[in-house]
């Protein structure tokens, strides 16, 4: 149950997909990945105000309790709802191989 | 791939399951739930330092990029890895009914 997609904090401030360019060195992958040399990492960044893209009932509860007890209960957090696969060319003991990762790039975001 | 479960910040400071007692009024449920009158809400709270309970490759990437660009990329966030079902007695137009919610109470936590 995805709740409202209207961000009350202003355009682009709430939980959404961002792209961050990163080198293999940035990711700590230089010693085991050959290619690509640079990755466009899609990740979920932004605030999760009341009921914005609430992933489920738990997120709705979290919003209510955060309002009551902000020092105890954190606000919901912007995390991937699904992922896009990505293929890497990896170094192996015997040479190189293609390896597909299903949980590397965020495809869609929600608050939980 | 769950990474280290040792919290470098000290006991109980890192991402783990907490229980928060909440009334129906706290949750905003008083008008549609009859019972239970009080809920022991289990939720995921705590810090996600480097590689602590990293849920997947995306979480590991997030840790690396947060270290490089802390103002752009947030640290991984402590969220439910799975849920426990909970049964509520709800008010309906015709009386009351039992309703099971699968996504209400956190069962296990990880960082993502």
């Amino acid at each position: 149950a995805r709740n409202g997609d209207h961000c009350p904090l202003g355009p682009g401030r709430c939980c959404r997909l961002h792209t961050v360019r990163a080198s293999l060195e940035d990711l700590g992958w230089a010693d085991w990945v050959l290619s690509p040399r640079e990755v466009q990492v899609t990740m979920c960044i932004g605030a999760c105000p009341s009921q914005f893209r609430a992933a489920n009932m738990h997120a709705q509860i979290k919003t209510s309790l955060h309002r009551l007890k902000p020092d105890t209960v954190p606000a919901p957090c912007c995390v991937p709802a699904s992922y896009n696969p990505m293929v890497l060319i990896q170094k192996t003991d015997t040479g190189v191989s293609l390896q597909t990762y299903d949980d590397l790039l965020a495809k869609d975001c929600h608050c939980i | 791939a769950r990474n280290g479960d040792h919290c470098p910040l000290g006991p109980g400071r890192c991402c783990r399951l907490h229980t928060v007692r909440a009334s129906l009024e706290d949750l905003g449920w008083a008008d549609w739930v009859l019972s239970p009158r009080e809920v022991q809400v289990t939720m995921c709270i705590g810090a996600c330092p480097s590689q602590f309970r990293a849920a997947n490759m995306h979480a590991q990437i997030k840790t690396s990029l947060h270290r490089l660009k802390p103002d752009t990329v947030p640290a991984p966030c402590c969220v439910p890895a799975s849920y426990n079902p909970m049964v509520l007695i709800q008010k309906t137009d015709t009386g009351v009914s039992l309703q099971t919610y699968d996504d209400l109470l956190a069962k296990d936590c990880h960082c993502i």
């Epitope: 290619s35 690509p36 696969p85 060319i89 | -």
Partner: nanobody, 126 residues
Framework: QLQLVESGGGEVQPGGSLRLSCAAS????????IGWFRQAPGKGLEGVSC????????YYADSVKGRFTISRDNAKNTAYLQMNSLRPEDTAVYYC???????????????????RGQGTQVTVSS
Amino acid sequence: QLQLVESGGGEVQPGGSLRLSCAASGATLDDLSIGWFRQAPGKGLEGVSCISSSDGSTYYADSVKGRFTISRDNAKNTAYLQMNSLRPEDTAVYYCAADREDCPVQPWGIVAGTSRGQGTQVTVSS
């Protein structure tokens, strides 16, 4: 705009062979890297093989190494995947994709210059 059409799939017994084709129209494959992917029932997309635009280098997933061979015929504007010693676990829909970037080609459809076809079904069963 580049369009890709896969063909050559079918049903085959374990140990059998198939040759998949990936025919391009709307652009030439000469300066593109070609990737083959597959998606088994209930599974995600998996990169199977890639042939590089820059130097013709070929890459394979560990699960198909020594059994599958990727090639291209620029004159026919077609890429191929020769699949030998097929196993039941090779059952999937097979897709080809092309990209201006070097290998690995990514499976994101028409995203950042990547094109992907509609797929051909391969079933390995006795």
